[in-house]
Interface confidence: medium
């Protein structure tokens, strides 16, 4: 890697990419943008899917954390030949199908969608696109939109979670590279550390969860700290404070020495979770220590 910014968050990332006729001469720039971005999400728990849409939506690469499959998926993406109409809603349908399936399998992993389009959507198609984006949201997804060239920012603000979730690229496709840093910063929700990482068995504590993107939730009142204890029971706690780079959370009382709590964060009241490799463990604390 080039030492640029990276994201350590464990969530499901869906790229929904416009491959309609109007991007025919710019597919290389779209591909390169996705490739650069994909390589910056580096958590082993991050899964990725590539979806393309024109007159139909196609899942080019199903959700996977396998880096070899992602490499092959990128190769398939590079071979795409654009053509057809801008049925963006079909892209969201393909994402929602996967989110729904994952939820039904008991995986409540947070989903982030990055949808890229150029040009304004015909009103009939915009109607469907916004509705399908809302369905993805109802399944717990956070939706970002990248608009290139002749896009309608008002439309994209309604398809995305808000106007703050829209990345306008006004200078054409070659300028896509310039927004990689800001997309990464905004779309990345990651848990980096917990302080303290060791707590006393049987005692109540507060934990500072360090990370990024905690205020990217549509509603910060719906942010939860989640503790998966010994890979079985999950306890959700409402944080005392939610800032972009940290959460202040009550830690569950872990009665026995050696117990482990894996830290997760939900941005939507427990509908789905950002996973991490951060573990809180218990130790014996003598009186007065």
């Amino acid at each position: 890697e080039d030492g640029g910014p990276a994201c350590y968050g464990g969530f499901d990332l869906y790229f929904i990419l416009d491959k309609s006729g109007s991007v025919l001469h710019h597919w290389n720039e779209i591909y390169y943008f996705v490739e650069q971005l994909a390589h910056r999400f580096i958590s082993p728990q991050l899964r990725m899917s590539f979806i393309v849409f024109s007159t139909r939506g196609t899942t080019l690469m199903k959700l996977t954390e396998d880096r070899e499959q992602i490499r092959q998926g990128l190769e398939e993406l590079q071979k795409v030949l654009p053509g057809g109409d801008t049925y963006m809603h079909e892209g969201f349908e393909r994402a929602s199908e996967q989110i729904y399936y994952e939820n039904s399998q008991g995986y409540r992993t947070a989903s982030v969608i990055i949808a890229l389009t150029d040009g304004e959507l015909h009103e009939d198609l915009f109607f469907y696109s916004e509705r399908e984006a809302n369905r993805s949201r109802d399944l717990g997804a956070i939706v970002y939109c990248v608009g290139v060239k002749d896009f309608n920012e008002t439309q994209l603000a309604r398809i995305a979670d808000s106007k703050d979730h829209v990345f306008p690229v006004n200078d054409g496709f070659q300028a896509l590279q310039g927004i990689i840093h800001s997309i990464l910063k905004k779309s990345c929700i990651e848990i980096l550390a917990a302080e303290p990482s060791t707590i006393c068995a049987g005692e109540s504590f507060q934990v500072v969860v360090r990370g990024n993107g905690f205020r990217h939730a549509r509603n910060v009142d719906r942010v939860l700290c989640s503790f998966k204890i010994n890979d079985s029971v999950t306890l959700n706690e409402k944080p005392f404070a939610v800032e972009d780079t940290y959460l202040l959370c009550p830690a569950p009382i872990l009665k026995e020495v050696g117990m482990k709590a894996a830290l997760q964060v939900s941005m939507n009241d427990g509908l789905s979770f950002i996973s991490s490799s951060v573990i809180i463990t218990t130790t014996h604390c003598s009186d007065g220590s």
């Epitope: 007159t55 057809g84 109409d85 015909h122 009939d124 198609l125 109607f127 916004e130 509705r131 309604r158």
Partner: antibody
Framework: QVQLVQSGPEVKKPGAPVKISCKTS????????ITWVRQAPGQGLEWLGW????????SFAQKVQGRLTMTTDISTNTASMELRGLRSDDTALYYC??????????????WGQGTLVTVSS | DVVMTQSPDSLAVSLGERATINCKSS????????????LAWYQQKPGQPPKLLIY???TRESGVPDRFSGSGSGTDFTLTISSLQAEDVAVYYC?????????FGGGTKLEIK
């Protein structure tokens, strides 16, 4: 003026396919979609499917998904539907209609005269 | 699927009187962005194909007499014939086009009392 003229009545045996055509005139064919609706004797209207004459996109009712094929021929401004594996409950008057919007199935502003399909052994 | 329920099933009204037909959808067919209700009304006379009367819940199709009007929003809609004429005897259907599959109401048969 806008006209949709359908092919004549059909009597078919169970399991056979039926193909109905719908010849249009009086408007630009690929500016509007075509939908197919049927009406069993003495019953209400049942939507079967829609095709975009502009890009071939289709949408089907679950009941006929897999049995219904819809096609369009821009050179003759004609839409067709084929329903395979006919059953007795497919006996109905089949209508084609012009759909407002070339992209998405909306309301139906002109209708064909209907084609009666009778399925009987 | 969006289920459309019409009431009453049949209706007898005197000539010159007002006729009111109701249609209820199982979910809202109002789209907030353009404030349009994705609902149409059709008239079907015996032995004829249906004919579009009203679209976007309240817009009259060209050539439709102004005694026909549509109203309502969200899930509840009404077709009103302000002064019934003999030629209005027919079955009337509502239809939603908010989402596929497109669905029709069961129909209301309008007769003269």
């Amino acid at each position: 003026q806008v006209q949709l003229v359908q092919s004549g009545p059909e009597v078919k045996k169970p399991g056979a396919p039926v193909k109905i055509s719908c010849k249009t005139s009086g408007y630009i064919f690929d500016d509007y979609g075509i939908t197919w609706v049927r009406q069993a004797p003495g019953q209400g209207l049942e939507w079967l499917g829609w095709i975009s004459t502009y890009n071939g996109k289709t949408s089907f009712a679950q009941k006929v998904q897999g049995r219904l094929t819809m096609t369009t021929d821009i050179s003759t401004n004609t839409a067709s539907m084929e329903l395979r594996g006919l059953r007795s409950d497919d006996t109905a008057l089949y209508y084609c209609a012009r759909v407002f919007s070339r992209y998405i199935p909306f309301y139906f502003d002109s209708w064909g005269q209907g084609t009666l399909v009778t399925v009987s052994s | 699927d969006v289920v459309m329920t019409q009431s009453p099933d049949s209706l007898a009204v005197s000539l010159g009187e007002r006729a009111t037909i109701n249609c209820k959808s199982s979910q809202s067919v109002l789209y907030s962005y353009n404030n349009k209700n994705y609902l149409a009304w059709y008239q079907q006379k015996p032995g004829q194909p249906p004919k579009l009367l009203i679209y976007w819940a309240s817009t009259r199709e060209s050539g439709v007499p102004d005694r026909f009007s549509g109203s309502g929003s969200g899930t509840d809609f009404t077709l009103t014939i302000s002064s019934l004429q003999a030629e209005d005897v027919a079955v009337y259907y509502c239809q939603q086009y908010y989402s596929t599959p497109l669905t029709f109401g069961g129909g209301t048969k309008l007769e003269i009392k």
